[in-house]
Interface confidence: low
């Protein structure tokens, strides 16, 4: 943005500037151009000898100037073009400067100006131009600064040429005010603040309704010497509920929200949502939906799941295999859990109670991302009801709950477990062991062992201690053993059929 | 020329079912959402139900929740409005009406319902 | 019982100025929400009047306009000619409700 101070060609010949010396040199011409009256000051002494004539401007107010621009419109006529050549024709002239806080009025001296340059056309006017009224134009810019009184003035010294000065225009530069990445810059001097630092560092303010983002830095710019705004450093971004349209932040529609600080636009209100009024930051769930605390606010709104489907409990022994499938209707959700509880009852009394204490789950039970366990432990003759939940991110956020149950009686103890203890050729020492808790309902064990491939015949053992050893058998033979409990009721679960094999004649180490 | 046309009305018996028809033309359908709004004889305008354009949010008013099923075929230009259980207090004219909501680009003014069927009338009685 | 409010009826002579009010609450005209205006005319599809509380679509005359202050919306008509002869409603829309938009009873307008 340019100021203007001084504009000679717009005040119409109004400005009477002063001459030196009175009444030679420097006069104020009006010509025709373009059919349109233009003023200028001309002086053409080119035969007379040395000269030294001088055009003084009016006193200008400085404002807040600190470097003025000078720019000069003008036209020269060439030296040949007078007789003889004019040994003492010159084709430049002098531009000088004087800076003072008050104006002198008509008391001019030379002495207090300071030359700013020689002014040299670009073109000169041959004759020919200047006949066919076709006259060469120059124009020139020159730079003055730092300025620091409260005015000066400008002169035009005339060392002989044939001169026309045409437009003479004096301004300084401002940055303009300028809106940028929603931050307001006011209008700026346009100075260097040193040789080195040639840019103003100006700190911008955030439009209405625009921030600084956190841990960001403000909105700053650079203004130049030229006026002109450099190097953005730092922004503003739209506060929540609003967003950016064109230079300024408009608060979000009803039906849309924005949730921080941020570049991006208001969003639609997520599914299941309420609509929003204007300028919001979030949408409300609609009545039976929720939002976990890590769930993004553009997010749609969800609900716990159903139960979980087609819960199934198939019972092995003192064992239990829990599967179901996922429920159907997730809430909107992926991150499902289960959870398993169980309650045992004594079929005699009726009487029931939790039972995580004594059973065991294949892996923990109040987190579980498959749809199936086993639970292990179980007592004999007891009645067991099993319930999975299914939850998910907001089932905390309900009182309610989504599960499903499945109930199985434990008949059987669990299989004992069998190992080998000793061996010899023709001896094998057995051991076994079922839950202490089961330990009581066992009346007896029998102990089934028979030669490997031998289908027709087999032996059986029955002790009420936990081992037994078989004799006679043959030497480096493998047998096949199992064991089974006997209680009051009759059979127990077996043990899985086992493979031992006594030792060789030739080596009997064990 | 912009146009909403509604049929599928007609007389039915209380309990029964009636699937409204709107077939859009002369504007991109797929770009707008749409509503039912009813008006019962001698009555005001009450609104029924909106589906947005792409049919991701839809609404019902409390008296027809449960009942009435909106839905859209962008692809034929066409609203319809599946209504079951069908009740004496439902009798009315129903008329489909284009709604354009501000985007976020666009941002105000929020259009309202800017076009209108000439509407269909649905009768239940025994 | 609608959710907005308006008389059932007014009346004006040719000519004559007349104004119909819309009462809401501030879970609708009050939360910010905007206020449509519609006109049906006998046996007719009703036809929306103004948009966004205050602007007109093109096609209708500027003697109708539309305000809203606080909780409430009106209608003014001025220069009434015989063919204003309608039901008017307005429309916007409601938080607490499930579906959101709410209408007013409408007024009937009568040009003497």
């Known amino acids: 943005k340019e100021v203007v101070l001084l504009d000679f060609a717009a005040m119409k010949g109004e400005l009477g500037w002063l001459t030196h010396p009175y009444g030679k040199g420097w006069d104020l011409m009006q010509n025709i151009m373009d059919d349109m009256p233009i003023y200028m000051y001309s002086v053409c002494n080119v035969v007379s000898g040395d000269q030294d004539n001088w055009l003084r401007t009016n006193w200008v107010y400085r404002e807040e100037a600190e470097r003025i621009f000078i720019e000069l419109k003008f036209t020269v006529r060439d030296c040949n073009s007078f007789p003889g050549g004019a040994s003492s024709c010159k084709e430049t002239f002098n531009l000088y400067y004087a800076e003072s806080d008050v104006d002198y009025g008509t008391n001019f001296q030379k002495r207090q100006f300071t030359k700013i340059d020689t002014i040299a056309p670009d073109e000169i006017t041959v004759s020919s131009d200047f006949e066919a009224r076709n006259v060469k134009l120059n124009v020139e810019e020159r730079m003055v600064g730092p300025l620091t009184r409260k005015g000066f003035y400008l002169a035009f010294q005339d060392i002989g040429a044939c001169v026309a000065l045409l437009s003479v225009r004096v301004y300084y530069k401002k940055c303009p005010e300028m809106l940028q990445s929603l931050a307001r810059f006011p209008e700026t001097i346009a100075v260097a603040v040193s040789d080195t630092q040639p840019l103003a560092t100006v700190a911008g303010t955030c439009v209405d309704h625009a921030v600084v983002p956190y841990g960001g830095e403000g909105p700053l710019m650079h203004c130049t010497v030229d006026g002109e705004w450099l190097v953005p450093i730092g922004q503003c971004l739209c506060q929540e509920g609003y967003e950016k349209v064109e230079d300024a932040c408009r608060a979000c529609s009803p039906g849309f929200f924005k949730s921080e600080a941020s570049e991006s636009p208001c969003l639609e209100c997520p599914e299941h949502t309420l609509p929003s009024t204007e300028g919001a930051t979030s949408c409300q769930c609609e009545e039976g939906y929720f939002r976990a605390p890590e769930d993004p606010l553009s997010m749609s709104c969800t609900r716990p799941p159903s139960a979980p489907n087609y819960l199934t409990a198939i019972g092995m022994g003192a064992k239990v295999e829990l599967r179901w499938t996922a429920p159907k209707d997730t809430g909107g959700r992926q991150d499902i859990v289960y959870s398993v509880t169980c309650e045992q009852c004594w079929p005699e009394s009726g009487e029931c109670g939790p039972c995580e204490a004594s059973v065991r789950y294949s892996e923990p039970p109040h987190a579980l991302t498959r749809t199936s366990v086993t639970v292990s432990d179980l007592e004999p003759h007891m009645n067991y009801t099993f319930a999975v939940e299914a939850r998910n991110g907001v089932s905390g956020l309900v009182t309610s709950r989504s599960f499903r149950t499945a109930s199985v009686s434990i008949n059987q103890t669990e299989p004992p477990k069998v190992r080998l203890e000793d061996r010899s050729t023709t001896s094998l020492s057995v051991t076994w062991s079922i839950p202490v808790s089961q330990q009581s309902r066992v009346w007896k064990y029998e102990v089934t062992y028979r030669k490997k491939g031998d289908a027709n015949s087999y032996n059986v053992r029955r002790t009420e201690g936990f081992s037994v050893t078989l004799d006679d058998l043959a030497p480096d033979t493998t047998y096949l053993v199992q064991v089974q409990a006997l209680t009051q009721e009759g059979q127990g679960a077996g043990s899985k059929v086992h493979e031992f094999q006594t030792l060789s004649t030739e080596g009997s180490a064990n | 020329e912009v146009q909403l046309v509604e049929s599928g009305g007609g007389l039915v018996q209380p309990g029964g079912s009636l699937r409204l028809s709107c077939a859009a033309s002369?504007?991109?359908?797929?770009?707008?959402?749409m509503n039912w709004v009813r008006q019962a004889p001698g009555k005001g305008l009450e609104w029924v139900s909106y589906?947005?354009?792409?049919?991701?949010?839809?609404y019902y008013a409390d008296s027809v929740k449960g009942r009435f099923t909106i839905s859209r075929d962008n692809a034929k230009n066409s609203l319809y409005l599946q209504m079951n259980s069908l009740r004496a207090e439902d009798t009315a004219v129903y008329y489909c009406a284009r709604y354009r909501f501000p985007d976020f680009w666009s941002g105000y003014p929020n259009y309202g319902m800017d076009v209108w069927g000439q509407g269909t009338t649905v009768t239940v009685s025994s | 019982q609608s959710v907005l409010t308006q008389p059932p009826s007014v009346s004006g002579a040719p000519g004559q100025r007349v104004t119909i009010s819309c009462t809401g609450s501030?879970?609708?005209?009050?939360?910010?929400?905007?206020v449509h205006w519609y006109q049906q005319l006998p046996g007719t599809a009703p036809k929306l009047l103004i948009y966004g509380n205050s602007n007109r679509p093109s096609g209708v005359p500027d003697r109708f306009s539309g305000s809203k202050s606080g909780t409430s919306a009106s209608l003014a008509i001025t220069g009434l000619q015989a063919e204003d002869e309608a039901d008017y409603y307005c429309?916007?829309?409601?938080?607490?409700?499930?579906?959101?938009?709410?209408f007013g009873g409408g007024t009937k307008l009568t040009v003497l």
């Open positions: 429309q916007s829309y409601d938080s607490s409700l499930s579906g959101h938009v709410v």
């Open positions: 589906i947005s354009s792409s049919s991701s949010t839809i």
């Open positions: 501030s879970s609708n005209i009050g939360a910010g929400y905007d």
């Open positions: 002369g504007f991109t359908f797929s770009s707008y959402s």
